[in-house]
């Protein structure tokens, strides 16, 4: 039960985390105009990974995409790559983890296969979370560097001609969304890895079988013992008459209304 809960919770936490990583990647507010200690402007600038936007006090907002690949800073390209890799790994991890969930029964998938899939998805979530955290952190570092550079040189020549007060940028909402989302995906991945340990079958090739003292009414069905050991794949033979041998795990193995999604 604890394993199922850990696995389910890990899946949900990772799902929220990946949704957050996608949201952060799409958000325009990775960097926002620094308003502190600046003249009050009627124009507010903010930038994302894909476009930069200007919101006027009139309420009009104009966004322009970065329609160049080669002209963009290498750091921005690296951040984009990290976020996309994070999303792709996370999406694959989600797909794998759906089939690995203990509460979902697909054909005759063995616990060992589910354990492997849980571990795979867990590792994918961890790497996905790390990619997101790394991407956001690289961007944040870039902002801090640029912020102090522009503070040291508040007036800069635009195109070498016009003297203009340089717009300084600070952390936008997307950075915080990205950090939290990356952290959640990482936590979800760790939970999946922990759940994998509980799902993995024992080292021995047979399970402990408990025999109950039985009276003359006991009738063993052919193949009944085989099913009771847990190695048989024929589920029709799995249920043994009361009083017969039963594995410790088999109590949970009967199909119930909760086994199908």
């Amino acid at each position: 039960m604890a394993v199922t809960a850990c696995q389910g919770l890990g899946f949900v936490v990772s799902l929220i985390g990946i949704a957050g990583i996608i949201a952060a990647t799409c958000m325009d507010q990775w960097s926002t105009q620094d308003l502190y200690n600046n003249p009050v402007t009627a124009v507010f600038n903010y930038q994302g990974l894909w476009r930069s936007c200007v919101r006027e006090s009139s309420g009009f907002t104009e966004c322009r995409g970065y329609f160049t690949l080669l002209g963009l800073p290498a750091m921005l390209q690296a951040v984009r790559a990290l976020m996309i890799v994070g999303i792709v790994l996370g999406a694959i991890g989600l797909l794998v983890s759906i089939f690995a969930l203990k509460c979902i029964r697909i054909g005759s998938m063995e616990d060992s296969a589910k354990a492997n899939m849980t571990l795979t998805s867990g590792i994918m979530f961890i790497v996905s979370g790390l990619c997101a955290i790394a991407g956001v952190s690289v961007f944040a570092n870039m902002l801090v560097t640029n912020f102090w550079m522009s503070t040291a040189n508040m007036y800069t020549g635009m195109g070498g001609m016009v003297q203009t007060v340089q717009t300084r940028y600070t952390f936008g909402a997307a950075l915080f969304v990205g950090w939290v989302a990356g952290g959640l995906t990482l936590i979800g991945g760790v939970m999946m890895c922990i759940a994998c340990r509980g799902l993995a079958p024992e080292e021995t090739n047979y399970k402990a079988v408990s025999y109950h003292a039985s009276g003359h009414s006991v009738a063993y069905k052919p193949g009944g013992f085989k099913a009771s050991t847990g190695f048989g794949s024929n589920t029709k033979n799995k249920k043994i008459y009361d009083g017969g041998a039963r594995t410790e795990d088999e109590v949970q193995s009967y199909p119930s209304k909760h086994d199908y999604v």
């Epitope: 124009v43 936007c53 009009f60 203009t164």
Partner: antibody, heavy 118, light 113 residues
């Protein structure tokens, strides 16, 4: 057709108060930032107050800060300017205007005259 | 506050003549985010409120004749009327639309000879 109609102007003694109103029609008032601009007898233009579409932002120059209050009622499509502690230098024609692209004032009312004199 | 300086204060012209008036701001009105200059030009005729002519330093408001042209960047801006008509006689104001308070110039009065 866009229309802005100011009212509430008049003669007031120094230190007195006055509330100007502006009735808007012909555009989406609730989505527009609005401003009050005054024109002195010497024909100089001065922005006295600005309010954002969602009431979240208001701005006043130092000359009127603490004395003037801009507000809006989106349900009534109305803009207001509460003026208190009026001075003789507040004598002007007060215009209500809508902010458009580039923060430019694209529509103006006909103005209402305010005279501060003892 | 941003100081807007307009020159000349008045211009006497003849119909059909080309007219140029300038506006200087004490700080750059160029926004690095969209590379637009937040400078606006208005026309005010006697007994009327100001009328928007040009915003973003060079974008004509709809309905404004194409004889009106705005140019300039940063701190120096120009309004040009390619061929003055009788109905163009008015006072022209420039406005800083970038920094609060959104300040106006003192105006340039266009008069007929």
């Amino acid at each position: 057709e866009v229309m802005l109609v100011e009212s509430g102007g008049g003669l007031v003694k120094p230190g007195g108060s006055l509330k100007l109103s502006c009735a808007a029609s012909g555009f989406s008032f609730s989505n527009s930032a609005m401003s009050w601009v005054r024109q002195t007898p010497e024909k100089r233009l001065e922005g006295v107050a600005t309010i954002s579409s969602g009431d979240s932002f208001t701005y006043y120059p130092d000359t009127v800060k603490g004395r003037f209050t801009i507000s809006r009622d989106n349900a009534k499509n109305s803009l207001y300017l509460q003026m208190s502690r009026l001075r003789s230098e507040d004598t002007a024609v007060y215009y209500c205007a809508r902010q458009g692209y580039g923060n430019a004032l694209d529509y103006w009312g006909q103005g209402t005259s305010v005279t501060v004199s003892s | 506050d941003i100081v807007m300086t307009q020159s000349p204060s008045s211009l006497t012209v003849t119909a059909g003549e080309k007219v140029t008036m300038t506006c200087k701001s004490s700080q750059s009105l160029l926004n690095s985010g969209n590379q637009k200059n937040y400078l606006t030009w208005y026309q005010q005729k006697p007994g009327q409120p100001p009328k928007l002519l040009i915003y973003w330093s060079s974008t004509r408001e709809s309905g404004v004749p194409d004889r009106f042209t705005g140019s300039g960047s940063g701190t120096d801006f120009t309004l040009t009327i390619s061929s003055v008509q009788a109905e163009d006689l008015a006072v022209y104001y420039c406005q800083n639309d970038y920094y609060y308070p959104l300040t106006f110039g003192a105006g340039t009065k266009l008069e007929l000879k």
